[in-house]
Amino acid sequence: VPGEAEQPAPELVEVEVGSTALLKCGLSQSQGNLSHVDWFSVHKEKRTLIFRVRQGQGQSEPGEYEQRLSLQDRGATLALTQVTPQDERIFLCQGKRPRSQEYRIQLRVYKAPEEPNIQVNPLGIPVNSKEPEEVATCVGRNGYPIPQVIWYKNGRPLKEEKNRVHIQSSQTVESSGLYTLQSILKAQLVKEDKDAQFYCELNYRLPSGNHMKESREVTVPVFYPTEKVWLEVEPVGMLKEGDRVEIRCLADGNPPPHFSISKQNPSTREAEEETTNDNGVLVLEPARKEHSGRYECQGLDLDTMISLLSEPQELLVNYVSDVRVSPAAPERQEGSSLTLTCEAESSQDLEFQWLREETGQVLERGPVLQLHDLKREAGGGYRCVASVPSIPGLNRTQLVNVAIFGPPWMAFKERKVWVKENMVLNLSCEASGHPRPTISWNVNGTASEQDQDPQRVLSTLNVLVTPELLETGVECTASNDLGKNTSILFLELVNLTTLTPDSNTTTGLSTSTASPHTRANSTSTERKLPEPESRG
């Protein structure tokens, strides 16, 4: 209209979805009486009356705003509750008197989108793709207005780059009027991107200013060809027979190629394929010296059928051979001498030791053990230990039994055994000598003999305690080609006074043993008895 002043820019009111917008009518008293105002919403140039103020009283017009409008601030402000994205429009108030004037308010609506949801390509990306491949998708749901997406790689924003990086985004409007943004990052990746961290960021605005939300960081499976294959052996370091050894093929490609492990046949020099487990690992358990040799790995790319060979690797399984002692079964007279010699082979330098079997005492460091002026006590076991000092646990041993000719020698001469009448008594008697003696008993009972070692025998006798047996006692006699010897077992009745308070009188008296190492007494008594020391 000629002469009419140009409309001023509307006042901006910013509000978040779901909250209340306060639309303050900015007409001055000179422009209009605020007790008589009409409020309109303007949508696509179309004006719709939504609220009337008469004499300071407000009245909603029927329609979409009917339930959400109320008057505040003595009639100067219209409150719009439960704001939705559809409310983003111009509202105007029009004063009626003294002359028609209007005041325009632009309502801007905002809503932060949900956390961006990133999904990585589950099938991965080959580095040799002809064009950018889909790396990851990013979804930002229920934002208003449409948020902006930025993709990052290792903390740096990604820019569109022809044939290398392409970002494709689209948005959909939900029934609520909110936007869901979907974005897909397409890129040509290189091998170094296998560890790259990607994430997406949503940038959006609220009345309080600019904000952003980041997705979690993801890595992308990147496929690249193998350039090198190699062998790895576990455990690392010196290997020995008996170890569990794993030989595995490794490659610098993803996915790894199909592996096979071969060992060079020492006689034909041909590579022979070894049988690996389901994981392609060659397990040597237990490792033997025959496993030593030259191994290599072949990696076959099933896509290109290109085969790669590793550097060969020498495997050494260290060993100690069976230990040989000479003489193997020495027999000597008392007073004579004996030289024991120990031999073994190994992949490493060996150390020898001689030990007394019964005591574990080290007698000699070296392969030769010399024994002079042999006594019958010198009879028994001698052990040669061949070990590799540089490899803990790598050793072999051999036991040799030295026999000293002599008549039977009793473990004890006489012994007292506490008994109870009618109990079944379990007696034992031990003797040694060379040749090995046999043992007989002077009473009837169930006897059994056990050879303890080449010179030693143990006989056990089960016998019922009778008055006659108490009278006579029990004798065991050991004999061999060179003589005989006897041990006597005196039987004495147990009085209740000989029992200790905590002993069990019913079961505790059921057995009694006489052996060279323990007192020959009933298990129910703690009373110590003199033990004769004479043994021969």
């Epitope: 999904q119 589950p122 099938l123 080959p126 064009e131 950018p132 491949e133 889909e134 689209s170 974005s183």
Partner: antibody
């Protein structure tokens, strides 16, 4: 509207090669990837192979050595070849479209039954 | 490979019931999970993607929840057309499906 339709021989002899075709309409193979998924009678679903919108091929490692997936964009067809068939390959074979902004399958074909028998 | 375990394998329910189907992943898959419905003689139909997003055109009685390794599909009020087999699928690393839950009329 988006549609996928599988076609194949129905019956295949053991040790022979299976050729399946997935014909699509309502979208372009250069904007959406397509996968093949199979379902043995009365059993669950098993992903076999995929071809991306960019033409990159992917295979289930359990079948990799006997699979080949390809496409003819002008005919809107995705082809699957599987050799050395055994009776356990008897299944309903589906092709499915990968959603453009996600990694799930938003449209599936009705499937084609393949029986491996002599 | 990531294994997907669905429970129960068979579920009997009546029209109007609220039912819950479970899916467990053998490792953390964040929310890379979809639910499908399959009726006899048909291809599967996607219901839920990204663990909790409803596919366009799917009735709002279907909802998905969960993250990490444990996921749930809930049908708030069963309708006659909902009796079918339901599969979950992970797309975090490769593609693997659960063995399915058959929902039958009690």
């Amino acid at each position: 509207q988006v549609q996928l339709k599988e076609s194949g021989p129905g019956l295949v002899q053991p040790s022979q090669t299976l050729s399946l075709t997935c014909t699509v309409s309502g979208f372009s193979l250069t904007s959406n990837g397509v996968s093949w998924v199979r379902q043995p009678p009365g059993k669950g679903l098993e992903w076999i192979a995929a071809i991306s919108s960019g033409g990159t091929t992917y295979y289930n490692s359990a079948f990799k050595s006997r699979l080949s997936i390809s496409r003819n964009t002008s005919k809107s067809q995705v082809l699957l070849k599987m050799n050395s068939l055994q009776t356990e390959d008897t299944a309903m074979y589906f092709c499915a479209r990968r959603y453009g902004y996600g990694w799930y399958f938003d449209f599936w074909g009705p499937g084609t039954m393949v029986t491996v028998s002599s | 490979d990531i294994r997907m375990t669905q429970s129960p394998s068979l579920l009997s329910a009546s029209v109007g019931d609220r039912v819950t189907l479970n899916c467990k992943a053998s490792q953390n898959i964040y929310n890379s999970l979809a639910w499908y419905q399959q009726k006899l003689g048909e291809g599967p139909k996607v219901l839920i993607f990204n663990a909790n997003s409803l596919q366009t055109g799917i009735p709002s009685r279907f909802s998905g929840s969960g993250s990490g390794t444990d996921f749930t599909l809930t049908i708030s009020s069963l309708q006659p057309e909902d009796f079918a087999t339901y599969f979950c699928q992970q797309f975090y690393s490769g593609y693997t499906f659960g063995a399915g839950t058959k929902l039958e009329l009690k």
